[in-house]
Every structure is written in C-alpha cells, then in structure tokens.
C-alpha cells in the first residue's frame, strides 16, 4: 500500500529540525535562563505539544487540542511584571532582556520555545509536515500556529495581575489595533479583579515624526475598553527607558540627548 500523500498548502512548512530546536530551547530556558523551572520535563512537553496537532487536519485544530499542554506547563509571572506588545515585538523583547524582571509572552517557557517557529501536521502521518503548512490567506484560521498563540496569549493575560504594561507602535496610524492579538484576545482576557491598571507605552520610531499618540482616537478606544472593564488606564508617549534602547542604535538623535 502506498502511503497517502500529504495535503498541499501554500505556506512555509514546519521549521527544519523542529524537534531539536524545541528541545534545545526548552533546555536552555529551564536549565540556564530560569533554573527555578529546572524540573520541567522537556521531552514530555514536546510530546504533549505534538499531540495537539499531529495526525490531524491542520485547519481543524481547536483550543481544546492544546489544553493538555497548558495544563502541563504552569508558570507564575509575578504581579506588575507582565508586558504585552503590539507591532513592537523587537523593542519589547530588547527591553525585557535588558531590564531582566519583566516578561513578554515570549519570555515565558512556551512562548520562548515557539517564537518564530512554524509547525503543522497531516491526517496521513504521525510526523510533522516538512513540505508545506497552511498560509494565513488560505481561509484556515484554525491552524496549529494561530490557535497555539491564541491559547497561550489568553492564558498569559488571564494570569496577569497588578499593573500591566503594553508597548504599542506610535508610528502606526492605529497604535491600538482592534484585530491584533492584544486588541482582540489579551485586553479582553485581563481579569479586572486581579489587574487594576493598564499602562500603555506608545513608542515612536526615532527617525519618524513624533506625535502625541496618547491623545489619538486609537488610544482613546483602548482607554474606553479598559475603563469599561473597570481598570485604570494610563498612557506614556515614548517611555524613557525604552527610548534609551532606541538611542543605542541612533545615539546622535536630538531626542537621545540627556538633559545635563
């Protein structure tokens, strides 16, 4: 019997050496970066992760498929240390890396492991599909990657407490974008009984025209959503510590001069 052929998609396939990268990142995170998580079993995490989507049609993945993974990997983020981001991933990651105490989603174990990787399975094989995976334009919203990020984004937000931060891109026409993961999942998953304040850091490209984005209609929309959920909203244009990181690349820019 000839094996059935794989479904063909237009998107990039599973990242080469996926399992090795997954295990390697898991070990780096649990043994070096966060040794308090050294008891996590990376092999078990990998097999539970794969169990969510291997041997399944990659357009029919559900949130429930990832439930065993979320149950297996528990990680507590301290209150006041959660940083969301929207269209500002690179700067947010630079900030948490240097600052050392705050967490973006990609500073959690599952986020760290999966960041920038691609994966999918196929009903005809128990292996991963290294030929092609669904592209976002293929009318396949319930694919393994999208569902994974929605699930762990929601959990990350649900677990947040105290004062939470979000870094937004002030150089965009809509720094707060309704259809982003932050705008559609995370802000609505914050528990008003645990989170009392959301603070937006609206960062502008250092070379771009700087505007008072905090008073824009886009940020007003976020403010109203946050207030409707009974939380305090605050907004800072070009949060200074993050601005300093931008200045490392462009130290001569006028906004990088320290007032002496």
């Amino acid at each position: 019997l000839r094996p059935r052929s794989l479904l063909v998609w237009t998107g990039e396939p599973t990242t080469k050496h996926f399992s090795d990268i997954f295990l390697g990142r898991c070990l780096i995170y649990t043994q070096i970066l966060r040794p308090e998580m050294r008891d996590q079993n990376c092999q078990e995490i990998l097999s539970t992760f794969k169990g969510a989507f291997v041997s399944k049609n990659p357009c029919n993945i559900t949130r429930e498929d990832y439930a065993p993974l979320v149950k297996l990997v528990t990680q507590t983020i301290p209150c006041n240390k959660t940083l969301f981001w929207s269209k500002s991933k690179h700067l947010a990651h630079q900030y948490t890396w240097i600052q050392g105490k705050m967490f973006t989603l990609e500073d959690t174990l599952l986020g760290y492991i999966a960041d920038d990787l691609r994966w999918c399975g196929d009903p005809s094989t128990s292996d991963m599909n290294y030929v092609s995976c669904p592209h976002w334009s293929e009318n396949c919203p319930n694919n393994p990657i999208t569902v994974f990020w929605k699930v762990i984004s929601q959990k990350f937000a649900e677990d947040a407490c105290g004062v939470v931060q979000v870094m937004l891109n002030g150089s965009l026409r809509e720094p707060f974008y309704k259809n982003s993961t932050f705008g559609s999942v995370e802000v609505f998953s914050l528990d008003p009984n645990k989170v009392h304040k959301l603070q937006a850091w609206v960062m502008h490209d250092i070379e771009g025209a700087s505007s008072n984005a905090c008073s824009s209609s886009s940020l007003n929309e976020l403010k109203m959503i946050v207030q409707k959920r009974n939380m305090i909203f605050a907004c800072v244009d070009n949060y200074r510590p993050a601005r300093f990181l931008q200045c490392v690349k462009n130290p001569e820019h006028p906004s990088c001069r320290l007032n002496t």
């Epitope: 609505f188 209609s217 959503i225 959920r229 009974n230």
Partner: antibody, heavy 121, light 108 residues
C-alpha cells in the same frame, strides 16, 4: 432566562427627582457593562448613560443629562440604578436598561421592557 | 458626535418582498454598527452587530453589510412579523453612542 426588569417610573413635576431601578437575572451581572437608553413619545432612541463592569468605577453620560443624572450599580442585588434629578419636560420618555455584549463590540443585546417617566406640571 | 442618517424614513412593501434599509454615518465608524428592530409597545431587539453578524436567534433572512460610512440592512423576504421600525447604532466613537432616526417598514 436572561432578563432585565425596570421599575421606578412615574409622573413628576419639573425640577423633581426619580430613581429608576433595573433588576437583572439569568446572567452574571457583574461581568457586563450596563446602559440606560430612552425614547421620547413618538421619537427615536437616545443613549443616556453607561457604567463599567464589576465595581462600576467609570460612568459615562449624554451631554443632555450630565450633572443631573447618576448611574450606579449594586452587584450584590444584581440591580442597575438611574438617579434623575432636576427633571425637565424633555426628559419625558420610556427608559430602557440594556446590557452590552460581553465582547469586543458594544451593541446592546438584552433590553428591559422599559419604564415610563412623565415630567409635567 | 457621529450622526447617523437612515433612509428611507418609511418603506411600504408587501409580505414576501425584499427590503433594503440604509444607514449613513457622518464619519468613518469602521464596522462598529448595529441594527435593531422595534415593534410598537416593545423594547428594541438586536438583529445585527459589527455591521454583518447576526445576533443569536435572528433568522437568516436578515443580513447586514457595509463598512466605513455606508451600511445597509436587507430583509430578503418580508414576513408579517417583520413590519416594524428599524434603528442603526454606532459604537465606534463614544460617548455618546448614537442611533439613527429609524426606518419604518409598513405593509403596503
């Protein structure tokens, strides 16, 4: 069954006060933004006021009622209130309480049957 | 504040006919628009939200379309119980939420 039931309407003279109540049942009241919307006789709908979920820290009002009306909620009683002071003839209307959808978008998906307020000398 | 203008004011049609109601916003409201039905002596009932999503329990003869400033509500085949007043409402820029003036669909 999800239900909203208004009460407290009646006849009042200009300058007088009334307190409307809206009893909620069949859903977790504390999780929803609540609104008051009114409809003058033979006219269209006019939004009056909104209150945030949970403790109701934030409130919003139409310009026409700002400073005269106060919205509040008692989550222990699953009840929404509208305290109306300094009433005017133009406040005469049916007052509906309405629940906002608990989603990203904010249409009003559950309405009470309304209570009538008449302001006249 | 955003002004919503509904047209026509009154629509006279027979059961079984198709009804198209329009709502125009004075500025862009994206897809943040709802449609309500109100019968005499009753509270409004949500039909459509986010411009094109049918609310729970609403028959599929009701459909909404549009985005930005121009929206429409279509009733593909009018049933006797569909004769009522219809309101659009925007929730993009608030406070205040604003409603259109209404379109009355009456029996011809």
């Amino acid at each position: 069954e999800v239900q909203l039931l208004e009460s407290g309407g009646g006849f009042v003279q200009p300058g007088g006060s009334l307190r409307l109540s809206c009893a909620a049942s069949g859903f977790t009241f504390t999780n929803y933004v609540m609104n008051w919307v009114r409809q003058a006789p033979g006219k269209g709908l006019e939004w009056v006021s909104s209150i945030s979920i949970s403790g109701g820290r934030y409130t919003w009002y139409a310009d026409s009622v700002k400073g005269r009306f106060t919205i509040s909620r008692d989550n222990s009683r699953n009840t929404l209130y509208l305290q109306m002071n300094s009433l005017r003839a133009e406040d005469t209307a049916i007052y509906y309480c309405a629940r906002e959808m608990n989603t990203y978008s904010f249409p009003m998906d559950v309405w009470g049957q309304g209570t009538t307020v008449t302001v006249s000398s | 504040e955003i002004v919503l203008t509904q047209s026509p004011g009154t629509l006279s049609l027979s059961p079984g006919e198709r009804a198209t109601l329009n709502c125009r916003a004075s500025q862009n409201v994206r897809s943040d628009l709802a449609w309500y039905q109100q019968k005499p002596g009753q509270a409004p009932r949500l039909l459509i939200y986010d411009a094109s999503n049918r609310a729970t329990g609403i028959p599929d003869r009701f459909s909404g379309s549009g985005s930005g400033t121009d929206f429409s509500l279509t009733i593909s085949r009018l049933e006797p119980e569909d004769f009522a007043v219809y309101y659009c409402q925007q929730y993009y820029d608030w406070p205040p939420y604003t409603f259109g003036g209404g379109t009355k669909v009456e029996i011809k």
